[in-house]
Structure formats: C-alpha cells, structure tokens
Amino acid sequence: MMTGTIETTGNISAEKGGSIILQCHLSSTTAQVTQVNWEQQDQLLAICNADLGWHISPSFKDRVAPGPGLGLTLQSLTVNDTGEYFCIYHTYPDGTYTGRIFLEVLESSVAEHGARFQIP
C-alpha cells in the first residue's frame, strides 16, 4: 500500500530573466527512493538516480542546475517556461509518487501591473 505523500514548493509566479527552485519532498513512507525524474509536460528535464547521480537533458543544460537536494534550479526564465512541472519519485517497494508545481513566468510589464506580491 502506498502511504507516502509528496509536498512541493507550491506554485510559483516569477519574473522573466529570474531564477527559481523547484522542490518536492516525499514523506510518510519508509520506501527507498531509487530515482527522481523532473518533467515539464512530456519533456524530461532531469533525472537524479540514487546510484548514478544527476543527468540533465541536453536541451536544458544551459538553464537547469541540479539541486538543492533532489530539487531543480531553473535559470534565465522565459515566458515559455510557464507551465506545469512534475517531480516523479520512483520508490521501492511503493512504486511511483508524483508532485505537481505550476510555474508562471511574467513579462516585466505584466509583473509590474498591479503587483503587490514579492516576486522571486
């Protein structure tokens, strides 16, 4: 039975050109994490394998950095980075747990319009 739960950083609104950290944390299970995949839509961004370490997809190498921890740092954000990101925890013996984070990247002009939020 899968008893674990995934906690995420929560959704994030950021400004074009900035950088943000996406993080997930698996709790309430003793299952062993064998691999964590980070995906956006149907694209694989990065893999953190318990034995082999990190692999960043070539198309994201310039703007994606591993960590902190099992998280992912996205740099030089563009409006095209807006979308849903998934942290997919492969565990034994539980199976797969998935967390969802939505990242909204705003043009500076939009970010300033009526903005009273702190932008990362």
Partner: antibody, heavy 117, light 112 residues
Framework: EVQLQQSGPELVKPGASMKISCKAS????????MNWVKQSHGKNLEWIGL????????SYNQKFKGKATLTVDKSSSTAYMELLSLTSEDSAVYYC??????????WGQGTTLTVSS | DVVVTQTPLSLPVSFGDQVSISCRSS???????????LSWYLHKPGQSPQLLIY???NRFSGVPDRFSGSGSGTDFTLKISTIKPEDLGMYYC?????????FGGGTKLEIK
Amino acid sequence: EVQLQQSGPELVKPGASMKISCKASGYSFTGYTMNWVKQSHGKNLEWIGLIVPSNGGTSYNQKFKGKATLTVDKSSSTAYMELLSLTSEDSAVYYCARSLRFSFDYWGQGTTLTVSS
Amino acid sequence: DVVVTQTPLSLPVSFGDQVSISCRSSQSLANSYGTTYLSWYLHKPGQSPQLLIYGISNRFSGVPDRFSGSGSGTDFTLKISTIKPEDLGMYYCLQGTHQPPTFGGGTKLEIK
C-alpha cells in the same frame, strides 16, 4: 478594457461532445494563462484546468482528465474547451477566467450546458 | 488535493453591519518563497464571479475599501465593514498555491 466573450448556451444529447469558445480582447492574449471553471447546481465552483496560450501547455484537474480538452487559437485570441462523452452530470455553467498570480482577475459571462435526451 | 473549508455557509445580515467570512485550508498556503496565493470572489445572481481580494489582502482594482482580507498559513478572513445592497451574493475563497486550485464551498450573504 479586458473582455472574455463566451459562446452561447447549448442543449446536447447524452454521449455527444461539444466545444465552448472564449474570445479574449483588451490585453495580450499570450501573456496570461486561461482557466476553465465549472459551476454545478448554482453553487459549487470547480477548477477544470488551464492552458498557457504562449506555448500550448496545459494543466488539468485529475477529475476532468479525459472529460475536458483545452486548446487555443492564438491568431484569434480564442480559448476553447471541448467536453467529451457528455452525461447529465456535465450539465452546468462553464466559465473561462484569465489568471494572474494564481487569482482569476477577469471572467467570461458563462456558458450554460444542458445535457438531456 | 487541498481542502478549503468556508464558514459560515449562510450569513444573514442587515445593511450597515460588519461581517467576517472564514476560510481554512487543509495545509499551509505559503509557498517556498513565502508567497500565499489566496483570493476572494463575489458571485452575484445572473453575473460572473468577480475578484475582490488577491494575495490574502490586496484589493483588486475598483474594489471598495470596505472589503479587507487577512490571515496566514491555513487561516484566512474576509471582512466587509459596512454591508451595502450590492454586496449580497455568494462569496468564495480560492487557494492557488497547490495544484489543483480549489475553491471554498461558498458563503451566502443575504438579508435577515
């Protein structure tokens, strides 16, 4: 002035599919995500999903995966929601709503869908 | 999914009253940057919902200052200082911090 103009009311038969449109004006269509919200029985509001007009990316409430399909036509600044395999449970008012920082700042006027044989 | 509980379900008022509506979430609505995406809406009969408050306490453009929002973590409140006829309708809170966004069940503001 920001405006979201939705298509008119629909009466459809069970098992059919239908598409609701939401035409945006008064702002840069690709600069904001577009959400869809269901209101059943004149009360409960449920988030169906959203689409990112700039890149076509989508995010769905798991409850509506397979029921709703979201698309956009950037050239006409129009968002669409197709509802599939309709049943009486799908009878509701559907709204499109623009979002900024995860709040829905402008809403369409709503489209009433009635599913009945 | 994050469960959002609104109280009361119904709020009978007289014009001029001050009222509070509560919104509680099943987990904290602060993201890792300390930003909380909690908004409030008024839905009047025959109209579309309208945004009143975003980011806990920021009034949307054109919203009168008799509306105010407060709270943090899992507990949030909408206050209306002097009820006017145009304030009657259904009030909803919405959490946008966690996927999927979820609405409270609504509070009906009606005349006693």
